[in-house]
């Protein structure tokens, strides 16, 4: 996606500082940087802080140990002031200075835009000693320059607690346009206008933008970066990209797909996770969303019973999670279930229908005509009842559950008995004398335990009392009958 149309028409020569012994004569401009005429002392006082010396490029003259001769001020020699080069090229520049041999331990550091360059940079300092002075050349090289190498570079030399600073070398890296904003993929409504943005920078500036739709240029004249393309509307998917051009060549952005929003595809793989007598838990796999987020889904339920009126129950639910518990169903019934989902454009078709069944339910009515009487000779309580009239959906009767509660003088004790479906009577042992026994009976199917009958109470006297009169629940089971003995 990146091509370079051409390199600079001419190379940009580097002008290193003079080698030892040579003179610099070009004082025409900043590009080879002249001093002021006459050296200025290094210890200038700061305008706003009178006590703070300004340590500049020039170290002030020093008297030799013999005290006989002044040393010249120290300053970096002038070098090229501005280097322009293309990205990925190599560059080398340097600072040079001649230091009298009486100075020891000179160190040169490189700085870029106020920060010291440490570590992985290629800085080499070479020393050329002579009788009285040592010429020092500090070279800095960058291989395959990047835009981030743009900046103002300076040398600093520490010498006798003085800091001598060179004039700057401006490094300007040019290259192919670099995108700061590329078009983004979008999902749009059919025939509705939308905007795409593309922005790229140099250097070199300017950067011009061409838009491309499905491999064809949209604009004949380039637009200055940043560029906003207004597309009046699409009827089908399209791919857009932008070309950024500058004097170095062109860079092409990523291609982005613009999709047209449509109704979703129907959900698939509707499956049953759990069935109870009155509910079914289903899940589904959403279909393709039509490039527009799902808003909600609709679960449609039809009873399969040929005698039913064929009406459809509709349950609306959120699009996520892709699961729904259908409630308020009849027990032991067959249903056909489908799912449809919608986005901003509309509803999908319904998924393939699946069959599901509810399980049998618990009985809905209690046993009838419950009667209780005391058989004192056997020291037990006889219980009798009539089988309840259960619906088919409640399933097959598997038995009965008897609850008997014994209460006397602040003590209460409940016991449960299970009996088979063929029985309509039971006997329970007397648990406590001089107490009240309260009996309730519920029918049981595979679907669960039905409601208990109304309670029937019988008083169990102390030993020696005889009374065979029953307590009973009159059909259809009314108030709280109790036998008073």
């Amino acid at each position: 996606a990146i091509t370079e149309a051409r390199e600079e028409a001419k190379p940009y020569p580097l002008f290193p500082g003079p080698l030892p012994g040579s003179l610099q004569t070009d004082h025409t401009s900043l590009l080879s940087l002249p001093h002021t005429s006459g050296y200025q002392p290094a210890l200038m006082f700061s305008p706003t802080q009178p006590g703070r010396p300004y340590t500049g490029n020039v170290a002030i003259p020093r008297v030799t140990s013999a005290g006989s001769k002044l040393l010249p001020p120290l300053a970096f020699k002038h070098t090229v002031g501005h280097i322009i080069l293309s990205e990925h090229k190599d560059v080398k520049f340097n600072c040079s200075i001649s230091v009298p041999n009486i100075y020891q331990d000179t160190t040169i550091s490189w700085w870029k835009d106020g920060k010291e360059l440490l570590g992985a940079h290629h800085a080499i300092t070479q020393f050329y000693p002579d009788d009285e002075v040592t010429a020092i050349i500090a070279s800095f090289s960058i291989t395959s320059v990047q835009r981030s190498d743009n900046g103002s570079y300076i040398c600093k030399m520490k010498i006798n607690n003085e800091e001598i600073v060179s004039d700057p070398i401006y490094i300007e890296v040019q290259g192919l346009p670099h995108f700061t904003k590329q078009p983004e993929s979008m999902n749009v409504t059919r025939n509705t206008a939308f905007n795409l943005t593309c922005q790229a920078v140099g250097p070199p500036e300017p950067v011009n933008i061409f838009w491309v739709q499905n491999s064809s240029r949209v604009n004949e004249q380039p637009e200055k970066s940043p560029s906003v393309l207004t597309v009046p509307g699409l009827t089908e998917m399209a791919v857009f990209s932008c070309e950024a051009h500058n004097d170095k060549g062109l860079t092409v952005s990523k291609g982005v797909q613009i999709n047209i929003k449509a109704i979703p595809s129907p959900p698939t793989e509707v499956s049953i996770h759990n069935s109870t007598a009155h509910s079914i838990l289903i899940s589904w796999v959403p279909g393709f969303d039509g490039y527009s987020p799902f808003r909600n889904c609709s679960v449609q339920v039809k009873e399969v019973d040929p005698l039913s009126n064929g009406s459809v129950m509709i349950f609306n639910t959120s699009a996520s999670p892709h699961m729904y518990q259908i409630k308020q169903l009849q027990a032991l019934a067959n249903y056909s279930i489908g799912v449809s989902c919608m986005n901003e454009i509309g509803w999908s078709a319904v998924s393939p229908w699946i069959l599901a069944s509810t399980t049998e339910g618990a009985p809905s009515v209690a046993p009838l005509n419950v009667t209780v009487f005391l058989n004192e000779s056997r020291d037990n309580v006889d219980i009798r009842w009539m089988k309840p009239l259960t619906k088919r959906q409640a399933g097959e009767l598997v038995g009965y559950r008897i609850s008997h509660v014994w209460q006397s003088a602040g003590i209460s004790k409940e016991l449960l008995e299970e009996v088979g479906q063929n029985n309509s009577r039971a006997q329970i042992s007397v648990q406590v004398h001089n107490a009240t026994c309260t009996v309730r009976i519920a029918a049981v199917t595979k679907g669960g335990v039905g409601p208990f009958s109304d309670p029937v109470k019988i008083f169990i006297p102390a030993h020696g009392w005889v009374d065979h009169a029953p307590s009973s629940t009159p059909a259809p089971g009314n108030a709280d009958p109790v036998l008073i003995i």
């Epitope: 020569p13 025409t28 590009l31 490029n57 870029k112 300076i154």
Partner: antibody, heavy 118, light 112 residues
């Protein structure tokens, strides 16, 4: 972002001196040259000189040598220009500007008006 | 010194017209490193100069593509393809190849 903020207008008497300031922000002050430019009312622009704040080196237009003195204070990122022995010819708007990487005066201060009048 | 001669001094235009400003130097502005340091500025009334074109033909960041620069050696031109009201002001050229830096005398772009 790069900004150069200059001091306010000055009304001074002939023969006096004035010192105007240019506070830089948004970049490394010690790494880029600051230039000063003069503009007399209704006239063109005249380059006065430059200072490199990193080491204090200066260069002057010969027409302004002895008239303008350029200094910089790195602790406050401020460049200064002192104009001395003022005459009516020195009444002008003075601009500071940064010499950017592209080797052009890319950002300018808003200008300081100096009026010399008795 | 490099003397910069700018013409015309005044340029009356109608909005939407093309405008062309010339700047001629008394010596070549090509520096020893191969670059030509000739820049163009616009100074709107009551404002500081603002950089438009640097090194002959490069538009500065944010400058509209109606502005273009060309030339080499000693002769340079700034063109505005379709003048708009916001373009009105004084245009200056500036050379920074030689010290002292020197400006053109300015061209005032005004409505006809």
């Amino acid at each position: 972002q790069v900004q150069l903020q200059q001091s306010g207008p000055e009304l001074v008497k002939p023969g006096a001196s004035v010192k105007i300031s240019c506070k830089a922000s948004g970049y490394s002050f010690t790494s880029y040259y600051i230039h000063w430019v003069k503009q007399r009312p209704g006239q063109g622009l005249e380059w006065i000189g430059w200072i490199f704040p990193g080491n204090g080196n200066t260069k002057y237009n010969e027409n302004f040598r002895g008239k303008a003195t350029l200094t910089a204070d790195t602790s406050s990122s401020t460049a200064y220009m002192q104009l001395s022995s003022l005459t009516s010819e020195d009444s002008a708007v003075y601009y500071c500007a940064r010499l950017g990487l592209i080797y052009a005066l890319d950002y300018w201060g808003q200008g300081t008006s100096v009026t010399v009048s008795s | 010194d490099a003397v910069m001669t700018q013409t015309p001094l005044s340029l009356p235009v109608s909005l939407g017209d093309q405008a062309s400003i010339s700047c001629r130097s008394s010596q070549s502005l090509e520096s020893s490193n191969g670059n030509t340091y000739l820049h163009w500025y616009l100074q709107k009334p009551g404002q500081s100069p603002q950089l438009l074109i640097y090194r002959v033909s490069n538009r500065f960041s944010g400058v509209l593509d109606r502005f273009s620069g060309s030339g080499s050696g000693t002769d340079f031109t700034l063109q505005i393809s379709r003048v708009e009201a916001e373009d009105l002001g004084v245009y200056f050229c500036l050379q920074v190849t030689h010290v002292p830096f020197t400006f053109g005398s300015g061209t005032k772009l005004e409505i006809k």
